[in-house]
Structures are given as C-alpha cells and as structure tokens.
Interface confidence: low
Amino acid sequence: CRTSECCFQDPPYSDADSGSASGPRDLSCYRISSAGYECSWQYEGPTAGVSHFLRCCLSSGRCCYFATGSATRLQFSDQAGVSVLHTVTLWVESWARNRTEKSPEVTLQLYKSVKYKPPLGDIKVSKLAGQLRMEWETPDNQVGAEVQFRHRTPSSSWKLGDCGPQDDDTESCLCPLEMNVAQEFQLRRRRLGSQGSSWSKWSSPVCVPPENPPQPQVRFSVEQLGRDGRRRLTLKEQPTQLELPEGCQGPAPGVEVTYQLQLHMLSCPCKAKATRTLPLEKMPYLSGAAYNVAVISSNRFGPGPNQTWHIPADTHTEPVALNISVGTNGTTMYWPARAQSTTYCIEWQPVGQEGSLATCNLTAPQDPDPAGMATYSWSRESGAMGQEKCYHITIFASAHPKKLTLWSTVLSTYHFGGNASAAGTPHHVSVKNHSLDSVSVDWAPSLLSTCPGVLKEYVVRCRDEDSNQVSEHPVQPTETQVTLSDLRAGVAYTVQVRADTAWLRGAWSQPQRFSIKVQVSD
C-alpha cells in the first residue's frame, strides 16, 4: 500500500481493544482545502513505541487504514481511497507493547466537514435582564453552528454551557452573570447538525466583570491650605483590586473597574459649575471651600455603589487682608489682587447661620488696580451685609472660573455689617472707686467682639471737666475693664468708651460722670 493512500488490507496487528484508560481520543476530521483533508487526535499515556493507525469504514462496509507512525495528525487528498462525498466512519487504533487501544468512532461526510472557527474579533458583551449576552459576527462561510461556552471565576474550575443552535450572520449567547466576582468566558463552535464534526478551538478569553462593581474602599486626607490658597487632596488608601480569573490577569479589556472622583464645591454657589468628575488617579488641588467628594466605581455594565465624604471648609482666617470702606454711595472691599483677568467669588454668610445658603457674587474678570488691589463694590440699596451683625466673608479666585479644580482661596475673614461704628459702641459703662486716686471702668463687650478679628481695640477717654484735659487709654479687645489712675479728688470727670476696627473708628459711648470724693480726716 502507498503511504498516501488508505490501505484496504488487514492492519499489521491484532485488533483486540485493551480497554485501557489511556489511548487515542478526541478524533476530529475536516476539509482543509477544496481537495485536502486532515484528521488529528490526542493520545493519552506514554508515547514511547506507540504506532497509530487511522481506520476508515465506507458505507459499503469496506474498511482501510492509514499508518501514521508516532504522528497524531494526518493529511490526505480526495484521491486517497476514502469517499469524501458519502458518510464514512473513522477511528484511531494505537498499537503499543503488544496491545491495541481504540478511540471513539466519528461518523461524518468529509466533504461537508469544515473546520469551524471560534468566534473571532470583537465579542460584544451586554447585560440583558440580569443575564450576560454575548454577540459576535459569524465567521465567513460558517453560518449554521452549534455554540458552547465555558466559564470560570477566580475560585472555580471551568463549567460548560450551551448557546444552542445558531444560523445567522451574527451569533449570540445568553450566559450567567455573577453578582460579585469576575468571570472568564470562552466560546467554541461546530457545524450545526453534524454530530461527528469537531469543535473549533476555544475563542480568546472574554473577561466579564461582576454585575455589581465593588464598593470603593478608599480614604482621603486633605493637606493644609498653602500660601497659594489651595490644598491637596490625597488618597490614603487605594481601592482594592478585583480578583481575576487566570485568563484575565493580563491587560484584559472589559473586566476593569474604573474609579472616578466626583467633586462638588459647596461654597460659592453662584459660580458656573459646581460639580466635576475626574479619574481617581488625578488627585486634585482644592480651594479652602467646603466640598462633597464621591468615589464612583463603574464597569462595562455601568456605575456601581459610591462612597461620599464631606471635606469641611478651611476655617483659617487671614489677619486683615481685607479693607472695607463705607461711603455715602455704598461699600467697597479691597484685597490683594491675583493675576490679571482673574474672576473673584465673594461669599458672605451671617455667623451662626452656617447651615443656610451663603450669599455670593461673581465679579467680572478683573486686573489689579495701580495699588495691586482687587475691588468689589455694592450700593446701600442692595442691602448686602446691611444688617448689623457679624458676617463671615470668603473670597475665592480663578483665572478659569468654569474649571472647578482651579479655584483658590484668596482670604477668609469676618466683617461686621451695617453701621458698625454705632452698633459697636460699648454699652453699660460703669465706674467704681478703686483707691484714693483711681477708679475702675467696666463696660459690656461690644457687638464687634462677636466677630473674630474685627475688634482691634477699645479706647477709653477720660476728660477733666475743670481743665478740659483729655486722656485716652487703648485697651486690648479681649478686655472690658480698665483702671484710671492719678485722678484728683473732688474733680468732676467724664468717661467714654469706643470700639475700633482696623478700618473704622467707633462711636463714643454716652458720657459717664464721676468724681472721687474728698477724704475728710478726723
């Protein structure tokens, strides 16, 4: 017999099957060209000294064999004596150590047995009613297939499933979707309705995230506000990485969980954009404003749970960086300007009403004035900061006001609104004898003292009514008492107290008359 032909003789060995667990298996035969065919199989067990024979029986009952030696693959043409247009039965007999092992039989029509390809290219993955739907284009000239999938998780071995029969230009499969673990899927195909035909290779892995992206377990810290009015948000704890099945541990597209940072600037609500979303890797600089920060986890199926933190405002106040002048036309604020064409947001809120919405105003982009100052003015009619109470003022600046992460804090300070001069006048001034030539003057704290940093000092004025001589005594803003010495008995004095701010002289309190009685000696 010629080696290229199927030999119609008895094979050169006894044909009893040993029934051993080892031996040939997984025989598959298919057409590889218009006139060429290939059969291949696996051999389980020691291969030394094994000779393989591919057996073939025609529908007429005649049988032949190809001797392939130690090879487990054979190519032959349609001229090899095997009928390719009619049904044939093929199997492998492997002869070793004086015994024969036989593979399961395959019955097929060789001409119609095309080697099917697995799903190639892009396999689209979507979620459909709590299940996974995969869809792909049918490989060319291979419409009509049976499709299987296998899937595993990081902790489980492969399990098979079926996509069922397919006969369209696109094929699809419904598969199980795990809630909390990633899965690796592979798909394979074979010709529809031909039981003996072989399966294609498995497709490349399709990596599928869990239905629920993991809860982002992260922690933040915020650095102190720098001299530029910005503070860095840093990630103290990275999100835990999703455990992946073996075939998804490379750069596997589709299984990734992306984490995004959603920033919501709570201060300065009149600015253009209050919320910004950015990748977690890009940790931003923030102004000293209050923010809500959310970390949102999402995968190819959409967003999952998020974690939200509140970052309180930086309450550090600047010592008198703000000048406020009150004139007949209105009020003007001055502060050290930032770069040219900067937009400022001036926000104010009565102290003690931090829960309520702050009032704010956005300036047009402005350049520094000749003195290097930026300004903001308002008329008396506007009623802004018109009430006689303490206001917390914060000024933010940005050259790009629509970019949330480019705002910085210029200053944070307090201001007493309305007619501070009058409202700040100390009341309940009282005089008590202290010694033969001195008195103690007490007063109730000025309303200005409720406003941190606003009250610069008290001034106590004492006038000798006889000589009209006046002396003034500065008193620390934390004190509400002073001792006046070197007074003369029997002389009438008047005492007044005023409260001054850095930019405003207060109004004197009502004059209080007193005198030190002359001591009569016995």
């Epitope: 299940q131 996974l132 009509g144 049976e146 299987q148 399990k159 098979l160 499933g161 079926d162 996509c163 069922g164 029969p165 397919q166 006969d167 369209d168 499969c173 419904l174 598969c175 199980p176 529809l192 309705g193 039981q195």
Partner: antibody, heavy 118, light 108 residues
Amino acid sequence: QVQLVQSGAEVKKPGASVRVSCKASGYTFTSYYIHWVRQAPGQGLEWMGIINPSGGSTSYAQKFQGRVTMTRDTSTTTVYMELSSLRSEDTAVYYCAKSNWAYAFDIWGQGTMVTVSS
Amino acid sequence: SSELTQDPAVSVALGQTVRITCQGDSLSSYYAGWYQQKPGQAPVLVIYGKNNRPSGIPDRFSGSSSEDTASLTITGAQAEDEADYYCNSRDSSDNHLVFGGGTKLTVL
C-alpha cells in the same frame, strides 16, 4: 406575562401524523430556544428536540430522527411539532418548553394529549 | 448517549430536610436543571445553573453539584412539596438533552 399556549388534544390512528402548535407570548420570541418534551402515561419526561426560533434550525433526539419535524412562524410567534408514522407507544402528553442560558426549561406549555389508537 | 440516574422514590418527615440526587457523566461538565411535577400538571423549574431559583420558588429549595452528581435539597419540607422531581442536563456525548428517570417524593 411570559407564556406558551399549546393546541388541544388529538386522537390519531397508527401510521397517521399529528401536528401540535405552541404559541409564545410575553417575551422576544427569537431570543430563546423552544424544546419539545413528551411524557407517556405514568412515565418520565423524554426530550424530543430543539428549534432555534431565530433562524429555524433544529436538532432532534436520535430516537425521533426521521419522524419528527419542528418548524416556527415568527409572524405569529408560534412553534410547531409534527410527528409522523404514529404508533401506540407515541400516546403521551407533548409539552413545548422555553429554555434559558443553562438549557433549563423555565416556561412550559400546558401540554397536549395525543392518543394513538386503532 | 449518557444517562441520568435518580432514586425512584424518597420520603421525608414534614419539616425535615431531604436531598434528591442525580448522577451521570454529563454532570461533570454541565449544570443540572431540576423540575417539580404534580399529578396532571406541567413540570415547573425549581433550580437551574449553579444554584439559581426562578422567581416564585421558595428559598427552601437549593441545588449543588460535585463531580458527576447534582443534588436538590429541600430544607424544611412542606406537604405541598410532595411531587415527582426530575433532573435534566446536556448529554456529554452528543450535546442533546437528557432527563433523569424521576424521583417520587413523599412527605410524611
């Protein structure tokens, strides 16, 4: 609501054919496979075959090969099962069933009793 | 073609736990489906896949598998659970489907 509604009971003579219909509603007809299962009186369930409503392709159990034909009409979302050369042992309740990804039959028709008697 | 083997009959005391098994070569590769059938009614799917319960199936029904055996467990059996139970799976040799012979469950 998802349901499969089958045609009524049939009485046939040996050698004749029977055609049972199964109308699907409440879901996308072409997205899920339909199977036919039969149950002879007092016996267990026996799988007969499958049809893919999307393209109409079929696959039959070896036992019924050559005698069973499954077809579908997408315009009426109906699947048909025809069994020919009937014999008395084909007397059974015939069910159609929709399968999910796991090839589990999540929705069943109410069953059609086919009696084969001379 | 492979077969699925079930015990023909199993009984359980009311409120106790019972396990119905299904054995076959195909179960080492495929998940089993489990069906409950009461006299004169169509079967109802109770467990499929790894351990999935269709909506409306009480959580006393659960499924598991190991090697070539699938199990249906009813924890705290009720009188209404008395029925025939069938398993099914893909056939490992020709990819058709196969049913087990069924198990008649009696609740005492």
